[in-house]
């Protein structure tokens, strides 16, 4: 695989180094219409323009090139729309599920400014998906249809290729703790998680079952306290069964011992209750007490990220 640009390289050198472009069988197809400009079947209300990637677009501000093209490849026509949509992906970037996630997402949200749009290569998309989709699914979010990798060009056509392969050598090793079991240690972090969850419950856990790659947490009948009910119906709370997506084969230290109470957060997806975070209830933990007490007065973000959880791997 190509060794491509570092974040410090100049924009054009960066792009030329990262592009694949040998003519192949694809050329006899006029590369399947990828090089159409404006995009075939789509007439933008504004002609393409180039502008600096602003500092308040943190997803892409540090991607390694300075100028982006609008409309972008996701058909966002204003910078405001790009910022709003891109912000949802920041937590995923923080998870460092794949080192090329930023390159991939920014090739779509803030494409490099050239005279025609350059798409990510299929293999770049697949690499990012392989690393990040399981994490998103753990929080009940499918990989979006818009990002289905078969829609992107083959690597031997003009496209942005895999840069780093997996994690850069400088990255800390990512532990295999279940995503739902990574913990926030500050009240702010806890409250952000609560904001992002449909429901928050203080409960006891009767037992844990393994079911088709998931862990199923079965709540004890008594001593349940709904801190945020959200979409939970009476029948949901009577017998609380929480699904920990892909949680059967990863460690979750706080669930090693089921004595005592737990603070659990989750989302309701297609009738199923998905666990998004779990903490041992600790009366002495000031951050937790503060977060629970002031969760409803906390100014939640205006947007909800695609998925929730700790901002950094532990």
């Amino acid at each position: 695989m190509w060794v491509a640009w570092s974040a410090r390289t100049a924009a054009l050198a960066l792009l030329l180094g990262a592009l694949h472009g040998a003519p192949t069988r694809g050329q006899e197809y006029d590369y399947y219409g990828w090089q159409a400009e404006p995009l075939h079947g789509r007439s933008y209300s504004k002609p393409p323009q180039c502008l600096d990637i602003p500092a308040d677009l943190p997803l892409c501000h540090t991607v390694g090139y300075k100028r982006m093209r609008l409309p972008n490849l996701l058909e966002h026509e204003s910078l405001a729309e790009v910022k709003q949509q891109a912000s949802s992906w920041l937590p995923l970037l923080a998870k460092r599920c794949h080192s090329d996630t930023q390159v991939f997402l920014c090739s779509l949200f803030a494409p490099v400014c050239l005279d025609r749009p350059i798409y990510p290569c299929r293999s770049l998309c697949e690499a990012a998906r392989a690393g990040c989709a399981p994490l998103m699914e753990a929080y009940g979010f499918p990989w979006p249809e818009m990002l289905h990798c078969h829609k992107f060009p083959l690597d031997n056509d003009l496209c942005i290729a895999v840069q780093f392969g997996h994690l850069p050598a400088t990255a800390p090793p990512v532990t295999k703790i279940c995503a739902q079991c990574e913990m926030e240690h500050s009240a702010d972090g806890l409250m952000e998680q609560m904001c992002s969850s449909d429901f928050v419950v203080k409960m006891r856990i009767k037992e844990i079952k393994i079911d088709n790659g998931d862990r199923k947490l079965i709540g004890a009948q008594k001593k349940k306290k709904l801190l945020k009910a959200g979409p939970l119906k009476r029948k949901d709370t009577k017998k609380l069964v929480l699904h920990m997506k892909n949680g059967a084969s990863c460690p979750c230290p706080q669930l090693d011992n089921l004595t005592g109470s737990f603070l659990v957060m989750g989302r309701k997806v297609e009738g199923q209750l998905l666990l998004t975070a779990v903490y041992r209830w600790d009366k002495k933990n000031k951050e937790m007490k503060f977060a629970v007490k002031f969760m409803f007065s906390y100014p939640c973000s205006l947007y909800y990220p695609f998925f929730y959880g700790a901002a950094e791997p532990h």
């Epitope: 399947y32 299929r122 829609k151 083959l154």
Partner: antibody, heavy 117, light 111 residues
Framework: QVQLTQSGAELVRPGASVKLSCKAS????????INWVKQRPGQGLEWIAR????????YYNEKFKGKATLTAEKSSSTAYMQLSSLTSEDSAVYFC??????????WGQGTSVTVSS | NVVLTQSPASLAVSLGQRATISCRAS??????????MYWYQQKPGQPPKLLIY???NLESGVPARFSGSGSRTDFTLTIDPVEADDAASYYC?????????FGGGTKLEIK
């Protein structure tokens, strides 16, 4: 030139499993998706799933989750589909098809699976 | 799921005339400025053969008598003029969304 060669016809008992193979040649195996498509006698086409051998990522039609399992072996450029808990409804011809730049443009010859006691 | 409705289910056309097959999607199959719609021909005992990709592009080696048109939800396969060898079943297929889906098929008979 690109070729997909599928394994031979199978006659299997109800409740059993079967593993179909699709050997690819003439291109870099990790570049193209391998799709599996079902066709019951005298019926139309039904997409089962696809696998990207480069990453191992799989994408299933919800209808076939639990029924079909896709794998790919890079060393032999071969894709596999395992069908489990077979019933008469699974009697069909199964095609593998490579999705290259932007279409399923290469197809295997098909494998006939008959489920009968 | 995106449902593809093909019409007619069967069609008889005289040699040298035009055959038109329609495919309607239950929702748009367009993204990235392209229509992810395909047309295949299948003869008994054979695998399907790609004719048209991305709604209107002719697959290499396919006669120019075949053409595809349409966008979003309405698509058409046209064969003009029809030849004896075109007797077969024709399927539309979308892959804009998972699961990928096929139309029910149109059986073309040459009179």
């Amino acid at each position: 030139q690109v070729q997909l060669t599928q394994s031979g016809a199978e006659l299997v008992r109800p409740g059993a499993s079967v593993k179909l193979s699709c050997k690819a040649s003439g291109y870099t195996f990790t570049d193209y998706y391998i799709n599996w498509v079902k066709q019951r006698p005298g019926q139309g086409l039904e997409w089962i799933a696809r696998i990207y051998p480069g990453s191992g990522n799989t994408y299933y039609n919800e209808k076939f989750k639990g029924k079909a399992t896709l794998t790919a072996e890079k060393s032999s450029s071969t894709a596999y589909m395992q069908l489990s808990s077979l019933t008469s409804e699974d009697s069909a011809v199964y095609f593998c098809a490579a999705y290259s730049a932007s279409a399923m443009d290469y197809w295997g010859q098909g494998t006939s699976v008959t489920v009968s006691s | 799921n995106v449902v593809l409705t093909q019409s007619p289910a069967s069609l008889a056309v005289s040699l040298g005339q035009r055959a038109t097959i329609s495919c309607r999607a239950s929702e748009s199959v367009d993204s990235y400025g392209k229509s992810f719609m395909y047309w295949y021909q299948q003869k008994p005992g054979q695998p399907p053969k790609l004719l048209i990709y991305l709604a209107n592009n002719l697959e290499s080696g396919v006669p120019a008598r075949f053409s595809g048109s349409g966008s979003r939800t309405d698509f058409t396969l046209t064969i003009d003029p029809v030849e004896a060898d075109d007797a077969a079943s024709y399927y539309c297929q979308q892959n804009n969304e998972d699961p990928w889906t096929f139309g029910g098929g149109t059986k073309l008979e040459i009179k």
